[in-house]
């Protein structure tokens, strides 16, 4: 008789999830000599231990602590780039500007990027059929808790000037409910972080509005100022040109505003 299985509203665990996490770990430690000491088998065991045999709506940050410990990594605290709803451009930027780091440029962020996972209470099985959706099912699911945990730690580590890339094409350029708005903003340490600089990325080619005046950006400025952190904002009118100029800063067209 087939065992009854909980049907969740979200997609199931990414296929070949264990193999993918292990492969990414091996690759990351090969590319980054400073992480060469990491034992990828132990990393996978700790990752698995965070959610296997546990109810996927009852995951805590504590569950991920063994993994956090194994994945401890020092990134230059003044070279951190946060992002919200504009991941691809943020990653393209750090691929070119190699001395800056998004969360997904760290080992733990890289391992989990674009993956979904969950288990089932009291069985050692991974659920490849469905996983809880943050809105429709529960917020304390394995994926959401993981990103909340690593995002908090990443923000806590930041210092000096912290940059954040925001999507100017969205109705809420700054969204209080995003990971950036609900976790990272509140975990920047005022005693370490001097300024949060927002880069608002324009979508339309003819869009010359000053999106730094958007009400949601003003809301972000208010939250940040109340935390005794300075705030600054820049419009990136031409993201394609912006990336090109990061690649080739000497280009004559890169002196004008982008």
């Amino acid at each position: 008789v087939p065992r009854w299985r909980q049907q969740w509203s979200g997609p199931g665990t990414t296929k070949r999830f264990p193999e993918t996490v292990l492969a990414r770990c091996v690759k990351y430690t090969e590319i980054h000599p400073e992480m060469r000491h990491v034992d990828c088998q132990s990393v996978w065991d700790a990752f698995k231990g965070a959610f296997i045999s546990k109810h996927p709506c009852n995951i805590t940050e504590e569950d991920y602590q063994p993994l956090m410990k194994l994945g401890t990594q020092t990134v230059p605290c003044n070279k951190i780039l946060l992002w919200s709803r504009i991941k691809d451009l943020a990653h393209q930027f750090t691929q070119v500007q190699r001395d800056m780091f998004t969360l997904e440029d760290t080992l733990l962020g890289y391992l989990a990027d674009d993956l979904t996972w969950c288990g089932e209470f009291n069985t050692s099985k991974i659920n490849y059929q469905s996983c809880p959706d943050w809105r429709k099912d529960c917020s304390n699911n394995p994926v959401s808790v993981f990103w909340k945990t690593v995002s908090r730690r990443f923000a806590e580590a930041a210092c000096d000037v912290v940059h954040v890339m925001l999507n100017g094409s969205r109705s809420k350029i700054f969204d209080k409910n995003s990971t950036f708005g609900s976790v990272e903003v509140h975990n920047l340490q005022p005693e370490k972080v001097q300024t949060l600089e927002a880069w608002v990325i324009h979508g339309g080619r003819e869009d010359s509005r000053d999106l730094c005046q958007d009400p949601t950006i003003k809301e972000l400025e208010s939250i940040i100022s109340k935390r005794n952190i300075q705030f600054s904002c820049k419009n990136i009118y031409r993201p394609d040109k912006f990336l090109q100029c990061v690649k080739n800063p000497e280009d004559s067209s890169c002196t004008s505003e982008i």
């Epitope: 070949r16 993918t20 492969a23 091996v26 690759k27 000491h37 990828c40």
Partner: antibody, heavy 117, light 113 residues
Framework: EVQLQQSGAEFVRPGASVKLSCTAS????????MHWVKQRPEQGLEWIGW????????KYAPKFQDEATLTADTSSNTAYLHLSSLTSEDTAIYYC??????????WGQGTLVTVSA | DIVMTQSPSSLSVSAGEKVTMSCKSS????????????LAWYQQKPGQPPKLLIY???TRESGVPDRFTGSGSGTDFTLTISSVQAEDLAVYYC?????????FGGGTKLEIK
């Protein structure tokens, strides 16, 4: 099951070039580095380098920096080794390989390249 | 580059005998971060690609018979076959898995009498 399937043997003239392929199955090459290793007849193994198919970043052994070019096509899950200006010294079996945990755990079957006039 | 030196270059033994082969590296393969040695051993049979036997100097790859044992630390490593079988006829290579460029030893050819 992880497999690396390499292209067939090549017989080429000195000065010519050749492009060898390695098609992966059982994993996404974007999640791994794809390595290449050279083995001349009756000789040992030499690491050529790796490519990261995710961003086309490469790393070569100094000896092969100017001799070999590594590329990849993520849409076909295939890595390539391009060898140009071939000489008899390039007559060898070329393997693609993938590291797992530590060491090269997966190897292609090898492609024999023979350079002869 | 780290130079890997294997000895002997060849040896001939009877089935059932114990075999040891040596691998020396020009620099330490010990990772100071985790105190593990980054050395691998491979077996290559005629007409086949190499097969990973041992990684981390002493950890057997899954499916490798327990007659194969790796030992050593720093710059001196040994592969031992406790009781050689006919199917162990092959060339055995050690590899620096510690730093770029990865380098291999010249190999030890094992022949069965």
């Amino acid at each position: 099951e992880v497999q690396l399937q390499q292209s067939g043997a090549e017989f080429v003239r000195p000065g010519a070039s050749v492009k060898l392929s390695c098609t992966a199955s059982g994993f996404n090459i974007k999640d791994s580095l794809m390595h290449w290793v050279k083995q001349r007849p009756e000789q040992g193994l030499e690491w050529i380098g790796w490519i990261d198919p995710e961003d086309d970043k490469t790393k070569y052994a100094p000896k092969f920096q100017d001799e070999a070019t590594l590329t990849a096509d993520t849409s076909s899950n295939t890595a390539y080794l391009h060898l140009s200006s071939l000489t008899s010294e390039d007559t060898a079996i070329y393997y693609c390989a993938r590291r797992f945990l530590r060491g090269f755990a997966y190897w292609g079957q090898g492609t024999l390249v023979t350079v002869s006039a | 580059d780290i130079v890997m030196t294997q000895s002997p270059s060849s040896l001939s033994v009877s089935a059932g005998e114990k075999v040891t082969m040596s691998c020396k590296s020009s620099q330490s393969l010990l990772n100071s971060g985790n105190q593990k040695n980054y050395l691998a051993w491979y077996q290559q049979k005629p007409g086949q690609p190499p097969k990973l036997l041992i990684y981390g100097a002493s950890t057997r790859e899954s499916g490798v018979p327990d007659r194969f044992t790796g030992s050593g630390s720093g710059t001196d490593f040994t592969l031992t076959i406790s009781s050689v079988q006919a199917e162990d006829l092959a060339v055995y290579y050690c590899q620096n898995d510690h730093s770029y460029p990865y380098t291999f030893g010249g190999g030890t050819k094992l022949e069965i009498k």
